[in-house]
């Protein structure tokens, strides 16, 4: 005997109390697949969460974090406090990056500046709490007699006067 519930589409549930009639999901609930015997309660975006997408009868709500927080985990299951650039979040709150480290985002941890010398390069721009160092040419490239960092201007062809 065919299970009549299999005919119930997404957005409905198979109501055994009413001879397996497909009843619409009640407000604040959904069923994303057919043949369901119950509808799932919609996620509520409350507190530090705000609604990005409301629940429909066939899909759950989706949440974002309110201003000053960012999402963590699958489907934004948690909200974590933002810090400023140049800081990282610790158990005691937002703390400035230690010397030699930086964070260019509002989330995540402070990371060490790039060690230019490991690549045989020199520091072109010093690092800050918010920005990594910028590595430039190696010291040898900048020594007297070495070729310039910028290519020479091309020589004019004979017989052409300057513009």
């Amino acid at each position: 005997l065919q299970d009549l519930c299999s005919n119930c589409p997404a957005g409905t549930f198979c109501d055994n109390n009413r001879s397996q009639i497909c009843s619409p999901c009640p407000p604040n609930s959904f069923s994303s697949a057919g043949g369901q015997r119950t509808c799932d309660i919609c996620r509520q975006c409350k507190g530090v969460f705000k609604t990005r997408k409301e629940c429909s009868s066939t899909s759950n709500a989706e949440c974002d974090c309110i201003s000053g927080y960012h999402c963590l985990g699958a489907e934004c299951s948690m909200c974590e406090q933002d810090c400023k650039q140049g800081q990282e979040l610790t158990k005691k709150g937002c703390k400035d990056c230690c010397f030699g480290t930086f964070n260019d985002q509002k989330r995540g941890i402070c990371r060490p500046w790039t060690n230019c010398s490991l690549d045989g390069k020199s520091v072109l721009v010093n690092g800050t709490k918010e920005r990594d160092v910028v590595c430039g040419p190696s010291p040898a490239d900048l020594s007297p007699g070495a070729s310039s960092a910028t290519p020479p201007a091309p020589a004019r062809e004979p017989g052409h006067s300057p513009q």
């Epitope: 407000p27 409301e54 066939t58």
Partner: antibody
Framework: QVQLQQPGAELVKPGASVKLSCKAS????????INWVKQRPGQALEWIGN????????NYNGNFKSKATLTVDRSSSTAYMHLSSLTSKDSAVYYC?????????WGQGTTLTVSS | DILLTQSPAILSVSPGERVSFSCRAS??????IHWYHQRTNGSPRLLIK???ESISGIPSRFSGSGSGTDFTLSINSVESEDFADYYC?????????FGSGTKLEIK
């Protein structure tokens, strides 16, 4: 900021039909329900139904099932309510309002007058 | 359909007074009640959601309480801009329904 724009007024003859519009802006149209609410002069609010623009899910108040049809145009972020076989009892202010459960943003309302 | 009964139909108070509005549901609706006010010739505005949750941008003098069948909206010190019609709405089951409203007028 979130806005729901509705025409101020519509005048139609008895027996005719009308299509009321509600243009949404300031948010992702397909992510939030649009509800329609009727208010006759000096009377309480009456929920007509709602539509989810993301997938065209609809729910209707049984009193309006043969009167109102809800649709959306996703390309213009506009919700519509088609009212048929109009009589003087359909003369009212019709509001569109955003929200799945509590209605957090409302249009200014369209005053529908049914008169010959 | 769930019937929402609001009482009284009219409340007369002076500015600065505390006022409470009542909304009674015909069956248990948990906390699926929302409160609105509507000034003359204006659109309704959401004041409280889910019986007691505050709404961003709504003054803190508005508060809500209750669950099951009996709900209350309170204004702890009425201001001149609060004189309006007040409606409750349930979202526990289809169709959504509104109460008949309470008019808050100046005494």
């Amino acid at each position: 900021q979130v806005q729901l724009q509705q025409p101020g007024a519509e005048l139609v003859k008895p027996g005719a039909s009308v299509k009321l519009s509600c243009k949404a802006s300031g948010y992702t149209f397909t992510n939030f329900w649009i509800n329609w609410v009727k208010q006759r002069p000096g009377q309480a609010l009456e929920w007509i139904g709602n539509i989810y623009p993301g997938n065209d899910n609809t729910n209707y108040n049984g009193n309006f099932k043969s009167k109102a049809t809800l649709t959306v145009d996703r390309s213009s972020s506009t919700a519509y309510m088609h009212l048929s076989s109009l009589t003087s009892k359909d003369s009212a202010v019709y509001y569109c309002a955003r929200g799945q459960l509590g209605l957090d943003y409302w249009g200014q309302g369209t005053t529908l007058t049914v008169s010959s | 359909d769930i019937l929402l009964t609001q009482s009284p139909a009219i409340l007369s108070v002076s500015p600065g007074e505390r006022v409470s509005f009542s909304c009674r549901a015909s069956q248990n609706i948990g906390t699926a009640i929302h409160w609105y006010h509507q000034r003359t010739n204006g659109s309704p505005r959401l004041l409280i959601k889910f019986a007691s949750e505050s709404i961003s941008g709504i003054p803190s003098r508005f508060s809500g309480s209750g669950s099951g069948t009996d709900f209350t909206l309170s204004i702890n010190s009425v201001e001149s801009e609060d004189f309006a019609d007040y409606y409750c709405q349930q979202s526990n089951s289809w169709p959504f329904t509104f109460g008949s409203g309470t008019k808050l007028e100046i005494k």
